[in-house]
């Protein structure tokens, strides 16, 4: 059972630019099968495509490899403009931040966005805050009806870019002192 | 005319190894990819791998563990070895041939052997 | 893997009628379809590939087209010799993988 395909196994058509890195090739259709380690990139012009063989895929292609078969696959990541693979993105469309191979319209809880390059990048991790502090005022705990009292956190992980700021790592609030009068 | 035919016992008992032979003629199996596919009693179709013109084989998953296609170029032949078999391997099983993306896949199919899994 | 749905799995249709078979991918298979024609005690045999590209020697009444998930073939108008099984194959990515196959026979 065959069916009559023709198949030029010179690139008949190798004056074509299209044809270039052939191992087939037809004046219609362009390449349909490419040298070794070259990938088959299906390109397409309004109704028209055509096969071409390229060292490199275009942006929004990645390669695809299978043993001795190599094609450019389109990236169908969701707002992704280039792949480096089928669930990787390396470049994200306009207004979006890449994030471990993803595209996010804001970054995940613990990130921050780099504009400059817009990436997700690992925000600054602050820890817990500690016990408000005594009730003070003028360092003394004693002699006036109001004070402010303070609690704090540590960073627990400085932020991947310096221009990244810390979240405050102080906060203090009004108190009433326990003593409005000192003693003695 | 590239002409593909398939070779082999029909008859093989569980756990036993299926072996085919597909023989080719009209074309050189060091150019293009050599594949084995089968149909199941129900009419279902499973490709299950390819050897290329180079000898590199791809198989797929759920028979990677106990299936191999090998070839022998100077006959111009490729084999299918299927091991431990049971009677879920029973089906018509055919060699095909495609060239790459660009072109037809298996624009050329050999006509097919039933092989029966039973003891 | 990629799951191929084909539609209708049989039919029956008059000669001269105009007959369309569906196939959908579970993801977007980016054109990489084919479809083929299994007549009883023969092997399949390519009807189209990438879509809609006609194999040599196939008559004209065949038409493929699509994108993204869902492609189809359509045969314009049928004639006797079309009956058998029809079956679509994506190679967007390993494994291909065929469909159900849809029966179709003269009414």
């Known amino acids: 059972q065959g069916n009559r395909w023709r198949r030029n196994k010179r690139a008949s058509y190798v004056s074509n630019p299209i044809c270039k890195g052939c191992l087939s090739c037809s004046k219609d259709n362009g390449c349909s099968r490419c040298q070794q380690k070259l990938f088959f990139f299906l390109r397409r012009e309004g109704m028209r495509q055509y096969g071409e063989c390229l060292h490199s895929c275009p942006s929004g292609y990645y390669g695809h490899r299978a043993p001795d078969m190599n094609r450019c696959a389109r990236c169908r990541i969701e707002n992704c403009d280039s792949c480096f693979s089928k669930d990787f993105c390396t470049k994200c469309k306009v207004g979006f931040y890449l994030h471990r191979g993803r595209c996010f319209d804001e970054c995940p809880d613990g990130f921050a966005p780099l504009d400059e390059t817009m990436e997700c990048v690992e925000g600054c991790e602050v820890g817990h805050w500690s016990e408000w502090g005594t009730c003070s005022r003028n360092n003394r705990t004693c002699g006036f009806k109001w004070g402010l009292e303070t609690r704090t956190r540590q960073i627990v992980k400085k932020p991947a870019k310096d221009t990244i700021p810390c979240p405050t790592i102080a906060e203090s609030r009004r108190c009433k002192m326990a003593m409005r009068h000192c003693p003695g | 005319e590239v002409q593909l035919q398939e070779s082999g016992p029909s008859l093989v008992k569980p756990s036993q190894t299926l072996s085919l032979t597909c023989s080719v003629t009209g074309d050189s199996i060091t150019s293009g990819y050599w594949s084995w596919i089968r149909k199941f009693p129900g009419n279902k179709l499973e490709f299950m791998g390819y050897i290329s013109f180079s000898g590199k084989t791809y198989y797929i998953p759920s028979l990677k563990s106990r299936v191999s296609i090998t070839r022998d170029t100077s006959k111009n032949q490729y084999y299918l070895q299927l091991n431990s078999v049971t009677t879920e391997d029973t089906a018509t099983y055919y060699c095909?041939?495609?060239?790459?993306?660009?072109?037809?896949?298996?624009?050329?199919w050999g006509q097919g052997t039933l092989v029966t899994v039973s003891s | 893997d990629i799951k191929m749905t084909q539609s209708p799995s049989s039919m029956y249709a008059s000669l001269g009628e105009r007959v369309t078979i569906t196939c959908k991918a579970s993801?977007?298979?980016?054109?990489?379809l084919s479809w083929f024609q299994q007549k009883p005690g023969k092997s399949p045999k390519t009807l189209i590939y990438?879509?809609?590209r006609l194999i040599d020697g196939v008559p004209s009444r065949f038409s493929g087209s699509g994108s993204g998930q869902d492609y189809s073939l359509t045969i314009n108008s049928l004639e006797y010799e079309d009956m058998g099984i029809y079956y679509c194959l994506q190679y967007d990515e390993f494994p291909v993988t065929f469909g159900a196959g849809t029966r179709l026979e003269i009414k």
């Open positions: 993801q977007d298979i980016d054109s990489y």
């Open positions: 990438l879509t809609n």
């Open positions: 095909a041939t495609y060239h790459g993306y660009g072109g037809p896949w298996f624009a050329y």
